[in-house]
C-alpha cells in the first residue's frame, strides 16, 4: 500500500481541519487507513481520524480540533494497520479556508434598492470574525453571461445594489463567499444561492 499524493490539509480556524490525499490504487479508506494527529507540545492527546473515500483512490479526513491559535502545529501520521505510510506536520493558521457564510437573504421591499444580507460564519470570539471580507456573485437565471461579482471589503455582511442595475422582470440568484485578508486564506466555498424576482420598473419619466 502506497501514498500517491501526500495529504494536504486546510483549517476552518475553528473546529475542523480537512485533509485529503490519494492512494496508489483503489482503497477502502475507512477500513484500511487511520490518520493520527497530535498537537506539538507536551501533554496533548493523540487523536485518530477515520478517513472516508473521496473517489476511487482518494481519501478525506475531517480532524476535530479546539479553536485554533496561531502557534498550533500538529504532527500527522498516516497508518495502514501497523505500517506507517506517511509522516508530516500541519500548521492550521498557515492553511486556512474559512467557513462559508450562511443565511443569505434578499430584501426587495425598498422599491429602488436590493439589499442582500448574510451571516458571518464565525462567533465574535474567533480571530477570523473581524477579518472576513466577502465576494457576492449575482447572476441572471436566464442568461449566465449576465453575471457579476461585488467585492464587500467592509466588515458588515450586507450589500446594497440599485435595482435599476438589474434587468426588470427577471429572476436573479445570488451567493456569497468569504476570505480573511490577514490570514492569507483561500476563498471559502460559496454559500447556498438564493433567488429573487426583480420587479423594479423605472419611473415613467425615465422611460
Amino acid at each position: 500500500m502506497k501514498v500517491l499524493q501526500e495529504p494536504t490539509c486546510v483549517s476552518d480556524y475553528m473546529s475542523i481541519s480537512t485533509c485529503e490525499w490519494k492512494m496508489g490504487g483503489p482503497t477502502n479508506c475507512s477500513a484500511e487507513l487511520r490518520l493520527l494527529y497530535q498537537l506539538v507540545f507536551q501533554s496533548s492527546e493523540t487523536h485518530t481520524c477515520v478517513p472516508e473515500n473521496n473517489g476511487g483512490v482518494g481519501c478525506v479526513c475531517h480532524l476535530l480540533m479546539d479553536d485554533v491559535v496561531s502557534m498550533d502545529n500538529y504532527t500527522l501520521d498516516l497508518w495502514a494497520g501497523q505500517q506507517l505510510l506517511w509522516k508530516g506536520s500541519f500548521k492550521p493558521s498557515e492553511h486556512v479556508k474559512p467557513r462559508a457564510p450562511g443565511n443569505l437573504t434578499v430584501h426587495t421591499n425598498v422599491s429602488d434598492t436590493v439589499l442582500l444580507t448574510w451571516s458571518n460564519p464565525y462567533p465574535p470570539d474567533n480571530y477570523l470574525y473581524n477579518d472576513l471580507t466577502y465576494a457576492v456573485n449575482i447572476w441572471n437565471e436566464n442568461d449566465l453571461a449576465d453575471s457579476r461579482i461585488h467585492n464587500v471589503t467592509y466588515l458588515k455582511p450586507t450589500l446594497r445594489i440599485p435595482a435599476s442595475t438589474l434587468k426588470s422582470g427577471i429572476s436573479y440568484r445570488a451567493r456569497v463567499r468569504a476570505w480573511a485578508q490577514h490570514y492569507n486564506t483561500t476563498w471559502s466555498e460559496w454559500s447556498p444561492s438564493t433567488k429573487w424576482y426583480n420587479s423594479y420598473r423605472e419611473p415613467f419619466e425615465q422611460r
Epitope: Q42, S43, S44, E45, M65, V69
Partner: antibody, heavy 118, light 106 residues
Framework: QVQLKQSGPGLVQPSQSLSVTCTVS????????VHWVRQSPGKGLEWLGV???????DYNAAFKSRLSISKDNSKSQVFFKMNSLQADDTAIYYC????????????WGQGTTLTVSS | DIQMTQSPASLSASVGETVTITCRAS??????LAWYQQKQGKSPQLLVY???TLAEGVPSRFSGSGSGTQFSLKINSLQPEDFGSYYC????????FGAGTKLEVK
C-alpha cells in the same frame, strides 16, 4: 450528563501510599483523557499527570518516580496511586477530564481530601 | 518550568462593578492559557481557554485577552455568583497554574 466521582481514604500515614479511584459517567474513557491535579494551601494547584484515551500516560517530572495512573475502560474507572507520601503531600486530589485537543480541564471530580499524618 | 504570576492576590469589589485579573508568564506561552473559577469548597470550573475562547455555558460578561507573556481576565458587571477564587493555567510543558486571585465582596 458528564460526571467524575472520586473515592479514596482521607488519612494516610507517612511513607504509605494513596490510592484514588475516579469513576466517570456521561462519556467514554476511550475518547477522553483524564488528568490528576492536587491543591494545597502551601503550593496551590499542581498538575500531577494524565492518562490518555489510548492508555498512554504523561507525568509531571517532579512526581514521576512515585506516581502511577491506570484505567479500566470497561468499568469507566481511572486509578491513581502515589507512593512514599510525606506531610507536604497533604492536599485535595482531583481527577479532571481533558478538553479536546487542549490539556485543559472541562469537568472535575469532587476532590479527595488527603491528610498525611502519623 | 514556566512560572505564572497572578495579580492581585486578593481583590474586593461590589456587585455591578467591573474587575480585571492579570497573569504573567515567565516566558512566551503564545495563547496557551486557561482561566478557572473556584468557589469555596468546590472544584474549579473552566472559564476560558486559548487565552480568549469562552468555555461552554460561561456567561458573556467574562472575557479573556492577551498573548505571549501578559494575559488578563475581565469580568463585567459582577454578579453575586462571581465571587470566589480565579486561577490561570498555561499548557506548555509541563502544565502549571498561577497562585490564584481571591475575589471578595466589598
Amino acid at each position: 450528563q458528564v460526571q467524575l466521582k472520586q473515592s479514596g481514604p482521607g488519612l494516610v500515614q507517612p511513607s504509605q501510599s494513596l490510592s484514588v479511584t475516579c469513576t466517570v459517567s456521561g462519556f467514554s474513557l476511550t475518547n477522553y483523557g483524564v488528568h490528576w491535579v492536587r491543591q494545597s494551601p502551601g503550593k496551590g494547584l499542581e498538575w500531577l499527570g494524565v492518562i490518555w484515551s489510548g492508555g498512554s500516560t504523561d507525568y509531571n517530572a517532579a512526581f514521576k518516580s512515585r506516581l502511577s495512573i491506570s484505567k479500566d475502560n470497561s468499568k469507566s474507572q481511572v486509578f491513581f496511586k502515589m507512593n512514599s507520601l510525606q506531610a507536604d503531600d497533604t492536599a485535595i486530589y482531583y481527577c479532571a477530564r481533558n478538553k479536546g485537543t487542549r490539556p485543559v480541564f472541562d469537568y472535575w471530580g469532587q476532590g479527595t481530601t488527603l491528610t498525611v499524618s502519623s | 518550568d514556566i512560572q505564572m504570576t497572578q495579580s492581585p492576590a486578593s481583590l474586593s469589589a461590589s456587585v455591578g462593578e467591573t474587575v480585571t485579573i492579570t497573569c504573567r508568564a515567565s516566558e512566551n506561552i503564545y495563547s496557551y492559557l486557561a482561566w478557572y473559577q473556584q468557589k469555596q469548597g468546590k472544584s474549579p470550573q473552566l472559564l476560558v481557554y486559548n487565552a480568549k475562547t469562552l468555555a461552554e455555558g460561561v456567561p458573556s460578561r467574562f472575557s479573556g485577552s492577551g498573548s505571549g507573556t501578559q494575559f488578563s481576565l475581565k469580568i463585567n458587571s459582577l454578579q453575586p455568583e462571581d465571587f470566589g477564587s480565579y486561577y490561570c493555567q498555561h499548557y506548555v510543558s509541563p502544565l502549571t497554574f498561577g497562585a490564584g486571585t481571591k475575589l471578595e465582596v466589598k
